[in-house]
Amino acid sequence: GSVKVLHEPSCFSDYISTSVCQWKMDHPTNCSAELRLSYQLDFMGSENHTCVPENREDSVCVCSMPIDDAVEADVYQLDLWAGQQLLWSGSFQPSKHVKPRTPGNLTVHPNISHTWLLMWTNPYPTENHLHSELTYMVNVSNDNDPEDFKVYNVTYMGPTLRLAASTLKSGASYSARVRAWAQTYNSTWSDWSPSTTWLNYYEPWEQHL
């Protein structure tokens, strides 16, 4: 039978080394055996490159393409092939479709005056455009109470957040995770970092009375 694309490729770039395209076929497909995504930078002399897609689900394919350190002018021509049959053709400008890398190494440390210090690492090296463009969202949730959660927007430069222990329930176990966004690139949010968990042992002041 004929091979058809149900949802055409949607692509995002981490704006440093990788672009990822995902699409959905109209029926379960062995992506790596049946399909190829070719990509070529619209730049004089550039070569045509081929990406072998992998299955994310039965009919969903994903392709990770190594790219050079992206610049705003870069535009790629993309062609999705099933053998000799061209299924889809389009263009992709990484600077217009940025999905930042996931922040790393989220840790929680007790700090002075009953505060918790949450720290994580900026996923970009200092020389990359995005290093100084990231803002973060930190989600803090009570492991035993789904209603007890807080969201903090970190819009200053440093990848840190100070959290008053008193804003959390005493004796409860909390988990935090962080994601990043690049405002000037109108990016999507990054994936959430892995969660880190800690016990909030703050003792409310009333108990001292």
Epitope: G45, E47, N48, V71
Partner: antibody, heavy 125, light 112 residues
């Protein structure tokens, strides 16, 4: 040492054909785009054509489009320029030159960093 | 197509002086910050051209530091300081950004 040696230049009548060759050595030929540039007697330099490292993409000056064909044989480290329907205004010294490194996603540019000695093509009746 | 305009078309300089050649393009040759696709070439009498400067300011291998390139966007300059008799020849700028590649008309440098 990088070397480019052109050959194939000759006296040919208008409407005739000629094939120029450029044999390369001293660098990884397949990794680089190659370019042909010509120079009419007493005139300036004129870009003619470019081919990327794999041979999969070619570019031409408007003056030669449809008449000239650039190609390469990476196994023989050789660049070619097939010239058909030649005209008097095609009379020139033809140089081959090493252009950008194309094995990277975005070609790395060093200008035309090495040139051959040139071969003379004369189109006259 | 991008048009390249070189000035002056001829230049006479005494040894030890500085020579400056200008090249202007009809469109920006900046692909990204720091990447201006403008080259300078020298063709000495009876020889093949040789590369001097690429990407606007980078010296080709073996080129003395007396040769320097500057500029961005559409305006570029080649400066030759402490000019020597050996620098005589025709200097060309060329845009390497997009097809068709194009050379300037050339500047003939004569040493007095």
């Amino acid at each position: 040492e990088v070397q480019l040696v052109e050959s194939g230049g000759d006296l040919v009548k208008p409407g005739g054909s000629l094939r120029l060759s450029c044999v390369a050595s001293g660098f990884t030929f397949r990794d680089y785009a190659m370019t042909w540039v010509r120079q009419a007697p007493g005139k300036g330099l004129q870009w003619v054509s470019l081919i990327n490292g794999s041979g999969g993409k070619t570019y031409y000056a408007d003056a030669v489009k449809g008449r000239f064909t650039i190609s390469r044989d990476n196994a023989k480290n050789t660049l070619y320029l097939q010239m058909n329907s030649l005209r008097a205004e095609d009379t020139a010294v033809y140089y081959c030159a090493v252009d950008r490194l194309t094995k990277t996603i975005r070609p790395q540019y060093y200008g035309l960093w090495h040139w051959g000695q040139g071969t003379l093509v004369t189109v006259s009746s | 197509d991008i048009v390249m305009t070189q000035t002056p078309l001829s230049l006479s300089v005494s040894p030890g002086e500085t020579a400056s050649i200008s090249c202007r393009s009809s469109q920006s040759l900046t692909y990204s910050i720091g990447y201006n696709y403008l080259d300078w070439y020298l063709q000495k009498p009876g020889q093949s051209p040789q590369g001097l400067i690429y990407l606007g300011h980078k010296r080709a291998s073996g080129v003395p530091d007396r040769f320097s390139g500057s500029g961005s966007g559409t305006d570029f300059t080649l400066r030759i300081s402490r000019v020597e008799a050996n620098d005589t020849g025709v200097y060309y700028c060329m845009q390497g950004l997009q097809s068709p590649l194009l050379f300037g008309q050339g500047t003939k440098l004569e040493i007095k």
